[in-house]
């Protein structure tokens, strides 16, 4: 495939992974769909650092962007060897797209570890810590879990679906990476008239 | 034997099974054949729980490297009079009691 | 303490001064049988469930304050004394146990 083809393809994939990464992230604010615990202390650790909002929404967004600019058509330098300037801009923001990528999983990874801050026999805490992620196979024991309500289901289906999507971002960060390093150095493969005139 | 205002660390050795990933008790029943929880450990020893009636005089610990659950009993009282189970909750955490240990006899006497 | 006979149906009630309903909606109930000289044993959690290796002749009802356990046939090895536990609110309370034996 064309490094231009790829990039674009790359990017409209990472920016779709951004926005389901902010909207998880947004949902561990709201246990259940309650608000009501959102200003307390009552979420855990994990929901704060934003994993999803920062590292796989924010962090990774500016790669998508790049990557499907890069996959535009014209720029500095005309012919095949155009979009260069717009490749290495992809190269710079694909890496910093990883680094996010990586904290996301980091923070979804450790989330799901510990598993939520909740109400278990009338004390507020990390009840499911010390279980190094042994809880998600015993989904008996959730229901000890008094306050937020269902928090342990919430949390777990939406960090869940954070670590797949930064390593999807990952996946796709370091695929760009490469394609976008290629189309640095060979340029794009499209024919001359696909350039603009 | 102990006499009141003394002090004992009770101990309970596992074996047969994973120690570390079972939330542990400890259970008393008295000379009146009456059962009563008296202190509950997370399987990691982060979390302890107790009823009013022990809380600040007995301390419940694990050592997962030894696969032993303690009960340290301090300021004894003449009603601390009782045998002592340990018993293991089903799960890291407060479930039910699936397995139960043979019993010690603690006697609080002048 | 319950006298019966042998063979015969025995219902052991439990009640509690206040509900036992867990805020996840379930209820911790658990029934136990201490038989002369050894360490108590569960039969049955969470209202109805039978723990492993317990004959279905035990069964568990009841919610809210009122709980039964039924043993449809009395066999010998069924006395001892029962004891329900409330697991659901700390601190957690034993019944004051119910006797069964040979009428």
């Known amino acids: 495939m064309c490094t231009g083809k790829c990039a674009r393809c790359v990017g409209l994939s990472l920016i779709t992974l951004c926005l389901v990464c902010i909207v998880a992230n947004a949902l561990l604010l709201v246990p259940n769909g309650e608000t009501s615990w959102t200003n307390t202390n009552h979420l855990s650790l994990q929901v704060w650092l934003m994993g999803g909002f920062i590292g796989g929404g924010l962090m990774v967004l500016c790669p998508g962007i790049a990557a499907v600019r890069a996959g535009g058509k014209g720029c500095c330098g005309a012919g095949c060897c155009g979009n260069r300037c717009r490749m290495l801009r992809s190269v710079f923001s694909s890496a910093f797209g990883v680094l996010g990528a990586i904290y996301c999983l980091s923070v979804s990874g450790a989330g799901l570890r510990n598993g939520p801050r909740c109400l278990m026999n009338g004390e507020w805490g990390y009840h499911f810590e010390d279980t190094a992620g042994a809880y998600l196979l015993n989904r008996t024991l959730w229901d000890r879990c008094e306050a937020p309500p269902r928090v342990v289901p919430w949390n777990v289906t939406l960090f869940s679906l954070l670590v797949a999507a930064s390593c999807l971002e990952i996946v796709l960060c370091g695929i760009q990476l490469v394609n976008a390093t290629i189309g640095v150095f060979c340029g794009d493969c499209r024919k001359k008239q696909d350039t603009p005139h | 034997l102990v006499k009141p205002g003394g002090s004992l660390k009770l101990s309970c050795a596992a074996s047969?099974?994973?120690?570390?990933?079972?939330?542990m008790s400890w259970v008393r029943q008295t000379p009146d054949k009456r059962l009563e929880w008296v202190a509950t450990?997370?399987?990691?020893?982060?979390?302890?729980y107790y009823p009013d009636s022990v809380k600040g005089r007995f301390t419940i610990s694990r050592d997962n490297a030894k696969n032993t659950l303690y009960l340290q009993m301090r300021s004894l009282k003449s009603e601390d009079t009782a045998m002592y189970y340990c018993?293991?909750?089903?799960?890291?955490?407060?479930?039910?009691?699936?397995?139960w240990g043979q019993g010690t006899t603690l006697t609080v006497s002048s | 303490s319950l006298p019966v006979s042998l063979g015969d149906q025995a219902s052991i009630s439990c009640r509690s001064s206040?509900?036992?309903?867990?805020?996840?909606?379930?209820?911790?109930l658990e029934w136990y049988l201490q038989k002369p000289g050894q360490s108590p044993k569960l039969l049955i959690y969470?209202?109805?469930n039978r723990f492993s290796g317990v004959p279905d002749r035990f069964s568990g009802s009841g919610s809210g304050t009122d709980f039964t356990l039924k043993i449809s046939r009395v066999e010998a090895e069924d006395l001892g004394v029962y004891y329900c536990?409330?697991?659901?609110?700390?601190?957690?309370?034993f019944g004051s146990g119910t006797k069964l034996e040979i009428k």
């Open positions: 450990i997370s399987s990691g020893g982060g979390y302890t």
């Open positions: 047969g099974f994973t120690f570390s990933s079972y939330g």
């Open positions: 536990f409330q697991g659901s609110h700390v601190p957690f309370t």
């Open positions: 206040q509900s036992i309903l867990h805020s996840s909606g379930n209820t911790y």
């Open positions: 969470k209202v109805s």
């Open positions: 018993a293991r909750h089903e799960g890291f955490t407060t479930y039910y009691f699936d397995y």
